[in-house]
C-alpha cells in the first residue's frame, strides 16, 4: 500500500459567544484538512478525532465518524468543527477576549487531529499537531493558512 497523506491546512473560521455571568467564552473552531489517497484503490476515512489545547489545558474535543470514502489517487478536503470552552478558572482570558478597546484578540491554540482510515479491513492512524492563532474576541473567517503560528517552540500570546 502507498501512503495516505493528511495535511492540516489551518483554521477556517472561529465563532465566539460569551456567558457573562459565568465569565466563559465559547469558541466554535472550524478546521480544514486535506486527505490524499495515493493508492490505486479506495480508502474510507473512518473517523477524525480532534482536540484543542490552550496552555497545555484541553479546552475542546470532537469526534466525527464515517466521514467519507476517497477514491484511488484522489484528494478530499474535510472541514471539522471543535467546540471549545474557556471557562471561569481562566477569567483573565475572559478579560482579554472581551477587551473592546483593541480589535484583534489573538490567542495561540494547539490543534491536534488524528485521522483513522481503513482499507481492506486494515486501519491506519495519522496524527498532526499545529499551533494556530485564533481571535477570541470576534467572529473571524480566515484565509487558509492565515492563522498559522510559526514560532512553535515558544508559543507566546
Amino acid at each position: 500500500p502507498r501512503s495516505i497523506d493528511v495535511k492540516y491546512i489551518g483554521v477556517k473560521s472561529a465563532y465566539v459567544s460569551y456567558d457573562v455571568q459565568k465569565r466563559t467564552i465559547y469558541l466554535n473552531i472550524t478546521n480544514t484538512l486535506n486527505i490524499t489517497n495515493n493508492n490505486y484503490y479506495s480508502v474510507e476515512v473512518e473517523n477524525i478525532t480532534a482536540q484543542v489545547q490552550f496552555s497545555k489545558t484541553v479546552i475542546g474535543k470532537a469526534r466525527l465518524n464515517n466521514i467519507t470514502i476517497i477514491g484511488p489517487l484522489d484528494m478530499k478536503q474535510i472541514d471539522y468543527t471543535v467546540p471549545t470552552v474557556i471557562a471561569e478558572e481562566m477569567s483573565y482570558m475572559y478579560d482579554f477576549c472581551t477587551l473592546i478597546s483593541i480589535k484583534v484578540h489573538n490567542i495561540v491554540l494547539m490543534m491536534q487531529v488524528t485521522v483513522t482510515t481503513t482499507y481492506f479491513g486494515h486501519s491506519e492512524q495519522i496524527s498532526q499537531e499545529r499551533y494556530q492563532y485564533v481571535d477570541c474576541g470576534r467572529n473571524t473567517t480566515y484565509q487558509l493558512g492565515q492563522s498559522e503560528y510559526l514560532n512553535v517552540l515558544q508559543p507566546q500570546q
Epitope: 460569551y18 473592546i100 478597546s101 500570546q157
Partner: antibody, heavy 120, light 112 residues
Framework: DVQLQQSGAELVRPGASVKLSCTAS????????MYWVKQRPEQGLEWIGR????????ENAPKFRGMATMTADTSSNTAYLQLNSLTSEDTAVYYC?????????????WGHGTSVTVSS | DVLMTQTPLSLPVSLGDQASISCRSS???????????LEWYLQKPGQAPKLLID???NRFSGVPDRFSGSGSGTDFTLKISRVEAEDLGVYYC?????????FGSGTKLEIK
C-alpha cells in the same frame, strides 16, 4: 518600537479645512483601532472617534459628526483626521492614540499631538 | 452620551498626603459583556495623557502601587496613597463602555 508620529502644527483660516496625519511604526494599523482625541487650550479631553483602518469603519462622537472625518491608508500605515468648516472653537491639540494588546500585556500609545490654530 | 462628572476640580495636597478623586457617570457604564471600562489618565503639562488604571481597578503596566482604583456602576474613585511630586498634573476619568466614549472634566492635583 511602537510610535505614532503626528504631522506638524497648522495655522488655518476660519471656514477652511485641514487634514492631520498620524503615521504608525512598529505595528500594522489594520490590526488595531486608531482613536482621535481633542484638547482645547487649558481645557479637558474630548473623544472624537475611532476608525478601523482595515475596512474604514468609523464611530464618531455626535458632536463631531460632519465636521471631523477619519480615514486611513494601510499601505502607508497612516491614519488621518480631516477637520472641516473650522472655527475658533476648533483651536486645539489633536492626539491620535491606539491600544495594542495581547493576553499578558496591553499598552496605550499616544502621538505627541498636532496643534491647530484657527485665526484670521 | 454618558456624562462623566469629576470632583473636585482642583485638589491641593501636601507631598506624602493621600489624595482621592471621584468620578460619577450619568448612567451605568457596565458593558453588555459584563465588564466596566472605566479608566484613569494622568496628563502632565505639555505631554500626552498616560493611562494609569483600566477596568476600574487594574493598574496599568509600570504604574506604582500607590495608585488604586475602586467603584462600580456609576461611582468610581482614584486614590493616591502618598502623593509624590511626579504625581502632580491633571487626572481624567474615561468611560469606554458606551459609544461615544467620554472623558471627565479633569481634576488638577497641585501642591498646597
Amino acid at each position: 518600537d511602537v510610535q505614532l508620529q503626528q504631522s506638524g502644527a497648522e495655522l488655518v483660516r476660519p471656514g477652511a479645512s485641514v487634514k492631520l496625519s498620524c503615521t504608525a511604526s512598529g505595528f500594522n494599523i489594520k490590526d488595531y483601532y486608531m482613536y482621535w482625541v481633542k484638547q482645547r487650550p487649558e481645557q479637558g479631553l474630548e473623544w472624537i472617534g475611532r476608525i478601523d483602518p482595515e475596512d474604514g469603519d468609523t464611530e464618531n462622537a455626535p458632536k463631531f459628526r460632519g465636521m471631523a472625518t477619519m480615514t486611513a491608508d494601510t499601505s502607508s500605515n497612516t491614519a488621518y483626521l480631516q477637520l472641516n468648516s473650522l472655527t475658533s472653537e476648533d483651536t486645539a491639540v489633536y492626539y491620535c492614540t491606539t491600544r495594542i494588546g495581547n493576553l499578558y500585556h496591553v499598552m496605550d500609545y499616544w502621538g505627541h499631538g498636532t496643534s491647530v490654530t484657527v485665526s484670521s | 452620551d454618558v456624562l462623566m462628572t469629576q470632583t473636585p476640580l482642583s485638589l491641593p495636597v501636601s507631598l506624602g498626603d493621600q489624595a482621592s478623586i471621584s468620578c460619577r457617570s450619568s448612567q451605568s457604564i457596565v458593558h453588555s459583556n459584563g465588564n466596566t471600562y472605566l479608566e484613569w489618565y494622568l496628563q502632565k503639562p505639555g505631554q500626552a495623557p498616560k493611562l494609569l488604571i483600566d477596568k476600574v481597578f487594574n493598574r496599568f503596566s509600570g504604574v506604582p502601587d500607590r495608585f488604586s482604583g475602586s467603584g462600580s456602576g456609576t461611582d468610581f474613585t482614584l486614590k493616591i496613597s502618598r502623593v509624590e511630586a511626579e504625581d502632580l498634573g491633571v487626572y481624567y476619568c474615561f468611560q469606554g463602555s458606551h459609544v461615544p466614549f467620554t472623558f471627565g472634566s479633569g481634576t488638577k492635583l497641585e501642591i498646597k
